[in-house]
């Protein structure tokens, strides 16, 4: 459940190699200003943030619980072929497998949060075979993708 | 470990600038979103400036709009804070702060360089 | 902005007792599409940087003790100590990161 050392892998990122003496962003400041980059702005940044993030925060729970996992005893569970169930194990009573299971048993469904509608979008369009380019971006965009994909390979998604 | 270190910081007659540094190490500084927030004896802490890891987004608390400008250096894990007209309810410590993977948390911070605006 | 309001201001605990801080905010910080209260919970020790304990509500960080705990949902949150130890003498933030950022004004720890 850290938040310590996570790379922020939906933001895309490029180095600036300019001198901050002569930063264009200290150049550029008054049209920011002038367009407006304030409280109100950061607002609507964070809201749009929110949803991206708690996914992120999922797929990142998991590729920590699937470290620790593999580093106690990996030999042993994949000679059991028990490497799937104990992932979920890890995963049961935490923050992930709890709103899997809240949007599982509805909850979140009567709530119409974007991650349902997203959730169920993709797995009507493997099922149809129509999963377009335009959907991958909207995922892609959402960091999203792997996490879904991760959903619907898993049996959380049998709604037992 | 992470590491945050800010520099920059002194007395100042109102009117003037002031550019604070601050330093990062111990995580890949430039996939993180990073903040500057004050604190001041009176106000507590107040959050002052954002920006986003690829420097696309930029937000500032409305008390320093149009007098401060945040920046950052990736190739030098640097972050910086240009501060401009500065007055007396400036006068604080200011911490640079490491967002975590959910904005506006911050799961690191320095700590702090004391900013004295006075004449 | 949304205010943070902490109680009390100062707060005196004999070691090994429960220290129970309290945080309202003016708006709800529960973000219903996840059912998380964006409500964080600092602790700044003199001449240390401030350290993350608590986010959404409930989940202490890594490396945190686990007599540090938060609860509470909406508009009020609290952060309990379940057994005051020296090393926990410190002035107590809580946060929220709904929308922008705002916090308490603090909660001073110290030893009855």
């Known amino acids: 459940r850290s938040l310590q050392d996570t790379e922020e892998k939906s933001r895309s990122f490029s180095a600036s190699q300019a001198d901050p003496l002569s930063d264009p962003d200290q150049m550029n400041e008054d049209k920011r200003h002038s367009q407006g980059t304030f409280t109100s702005d950061y607002s609507k940044y964070l809201d749009s943030r929110r949803a991206q993030d708690f996914v992120q925060w999922l797929m990142n729970t998991k590729r920590n619980r699937n470290n620790i996992a593999k580093r106690h005893d990996e030999f042993e569970r994949h000679a059991e072929g028990t490497f799937t169930s104990d992932v979920s194990s890890y995963l049961e009573g935490q923050a992930a497998k709890e709103f899997i299971a809240w949007l599982v048993k509805g909850r979140g469904r009567r709530d119409f949060p974007e991650e349902v509608a997203i959730v169920e979008e993709l797995g009507r369009r493997h099922a149809d075979g129509s999963f377009s380019d335009e959907m991958n971006t909207i995922l892609d965009n959402l960091a999203a993708r792997d996490f879904i994909n991760w959903l619907i390979q898993t049996k959380i998604t049998d709604r037992k | 470990q992470v590491q945050l270190v800010e520099s920059g910081g002194g007395v100042v007659q109102p009117g003037r600038s002031l550019r604070l540094s601050c330093a990062a190490s111990?995580?890949?500084?430039?996939?993180?979103?990073m903040h500057w927030v004050r604190q001041a004896p009176v106000k507590g802490l107040e959050w002052v400036a954002f920006i986003s890891n690829d420097k696309n987004n930029k937000f500032y608390a409305d008390s320093v709009k149009g007098r401060f400008t945040i920046s950052r250096d990736n190739s030098r894990d640097t972050l910086y804070l240009q501060m401009n007209s500065l007055t007396p309810e400036d006068t604080a410590v200011y911490y640079c702060?490491?967002?975590?993977?959910?904005?506006?948390?911050?799961?690191?911070w320095g700590q702090g360089t004391l900013v004295t605006v006075s004449s | 902005d949304i205010v943070m309001t902490q109680s009390p201001d100062s707060l005196a605990v004999s070691l090994g007792e429960r220290a129970t801080i309290n945080c309202k905010s003016s708006q709800s910080v529960l973000y219903s599409s996840n059912n998380k209260n964006y409500l964080a919970w600092y602790q700044q020790k003199p001449g240390q940087p401030l350290k993350l304990l608590i986010y959404?509500?409930?989940i202490r960080e890594s490396g945190v003790p686990d007599r540090f705990s938060g609860s509470g949902s909406g508009t009020d949150f609290t952060l309990t100590i379940s057994s005051l130890q020296a090393e926990d003498v410190a002035v107590y933030y809580c946060q929220q990161f709904y929308t922008v950022p705002t916090f308490g004004l603090g909660t001073k720890l110290e030893i009855k």
């Open positions: 959404w509500a409930s």
């Open positions: 702060a490491k967002e975590s993977i959910l904005a506006a948390l911050f799961d690191y």
């Open positions: 111990g995580f890949t500084f430039s996939t993180f979103g």
